[in-house]
């Protein structure tokens, strides 16, 4: 099943997030992703856990997953590079870089997103944008068109409370509020964008969604700048 959902959000304006990618397995949406360079998409490492021998591709320039759009194009993946420290049983280092079979054709609906290199926490309360094609309600309805939600960043101390994530949120992770509006498994790999810059990637650990005591967890890309640069080099 697809890993992800946007809960309590609404349909995004078409092609207003030209960095947005759909990581697909055998032609179906699996995870979100974000174009960070002409030939590279950043996603979550856990997304490929279920991929096995399936065909992984990346859809760029899409708003609707099913409807024809002039900007839409499906790319094969030349290689998949999960973070070397990512492990199936933890949310740590949950990053994956996918090299496209060729450089993406850039245009108004396909553009890389600048990513944060300064390793500093986003201020609590900052409103950030998350988008994805994950299910939109607890009944499991999958949207055809991209959804988005605006979420406030939550301070790490609160997120690490025993009633919340109980110390699991390291300095390389960040949290956003999850009170009815939330990202979830199905949006794994998708971007958390603050101030026009990629700050976080939706982690793909399983957790309850839309519950304020279980905030959304995002991998801080700035904390992995050296690794990203080394792979893209």
């Amino acid at each position: 099943p697809p890993r992800g959902r946007i809960l309590g959000g609404r349909e995004a304006e078409a092609h207003a997030r030209p960095y947005m990618a759909s990581v697909q397995l055998n032609g179906a949406h699996l995870c979100g992703g974000v174009l960070v360079a002409e030939q590279w998409v950043l996603s979550a490492a856990h997304c490929l856990e279920d991929a096995a021998d399936g065909k992984v591709q990346v859809l760029l320039g899409a708003h609707s997953l099913s409807q024809p759009e002039p900007s839409k194009r499906l790319y094969d993946v030349l290689r998949a590079v999960p973070h070397p420290d990512s492990q199936p049983d933890t949310i740590d280092h949950d990053l994956l870089l996918l090299q496209l079979s060729e450089k993406a054709t850039l245009g108004p609906a396909v553009r890389p997103l600048p990513w944060q290199r300064v390793d500093r926490d986003v201020a609590p309360g900052t409103l950030c944008d998350v988008a994805g094609w994950g299910i939109v309600n607890h009944a499991g309805r999958r949207p055809d068109s991209l959804q988005h939600v605006l979420l406030p960043v939550l301070d790490r101390a609160t997120c690490n409370r025993r009633t919340h994530h109980d110390g699991a949120i390291t300095e390389r992770l960040m949290c956003a509020e999850s009170n009815r509006r939330d990202s979830c498994k199905g949006d794994s790999g998708g971007p958390l964008v603050c101030g026009g810059v990629l700050e976080g990637v939706v982690t793909s650990g399983s957790r309850v969604c839309g519950n304020r005591k279980k905030p959304g967890i995002y991998t801080r890309v700035a904390s992995y700048a050296a690794w990203i640069d080394s792979v893209l080099a």
Epitope: A16, E69, D129
Partner: antibody, heavy 117, light 112 residues
Framework: QVQLQQSAAELARPGASVKMSCKAS????????MHWVKQRPGQGLEWIGY????????DYNQKFKDKTALTADKSSSTAYMQLSSLTSEDSAVYYC??????????WGQGTLVTVSA | DIVMSQSPSSLAVSVGEKVTMSCKSS????????????LAWYQQKPGQSPKLLIY???TRESGVPDRFTGSGSGTDFTLTISSVKAEDLAVYYC????????FGAGTKLELK
Amino acid sequence: QVQLQQSAAELARPGASVKMSCKASGYTFTDYTMHWVKQRPGQGLEWIGYINPSGGYTDYNQKFKDKTALTADKSSSTAYMQLSSLTSEDSAVYYCARRRDYWFAYWGQGTLVTVSA
Amino acid sequence: DIVMSQSPSSLAVSVGEKVTMSCKSSQSLLYSGNQKNYLAWYQQKPGQSPKLLIYWASTRESGVPDRFTGSGSGTDFTLTISSVKAEDLAVYYCHQYYSYLTFGAGTKLELK
């Protein structure tokens, strides 16, 4: 109903900067991009770029990339455009506009910028 | 970028007359996947902001009088006003949204 209210006319010296505003009402500000369009006196329309107020993402017409900076304040539902290093070529009416689907269905009333020594 | 060329640049008409103006694009605006032309028309009266008239090349915006008709496909498009009224005197712009947004230079409709 959707309304875009732009700031008053600006008179500026060559080399100076101006910052104009566009206050949106009648819809959820963070759900739509805000675009900016330039119109020189007696001339046609030129697309400058847009900001997505939700995440702050911006995209520019390459011609205007070094000239303009687009920002947005979610708390006041206001988009801003700053023009820098002004020359007489920047004298124009600047419109903010909002799309409905792919086309511009809503326009501000325009802000006239006059650059003169 | 896609270049939009409008002709004529100005047009002198009498009230009640039928007028047509042309817009040509440097590449096709027709997407075969949905058979839609990514083109809009706007009207701009003196001292006012542009107003949307037509989108998808031929779909009239709500509230726009039916004397305004958009037609054409691919690279050649036409805006027709079946019987011009004095209030139609304005500049008309075509606009493509197939790729990076560009506008034509406009056709000015004036009284003879």
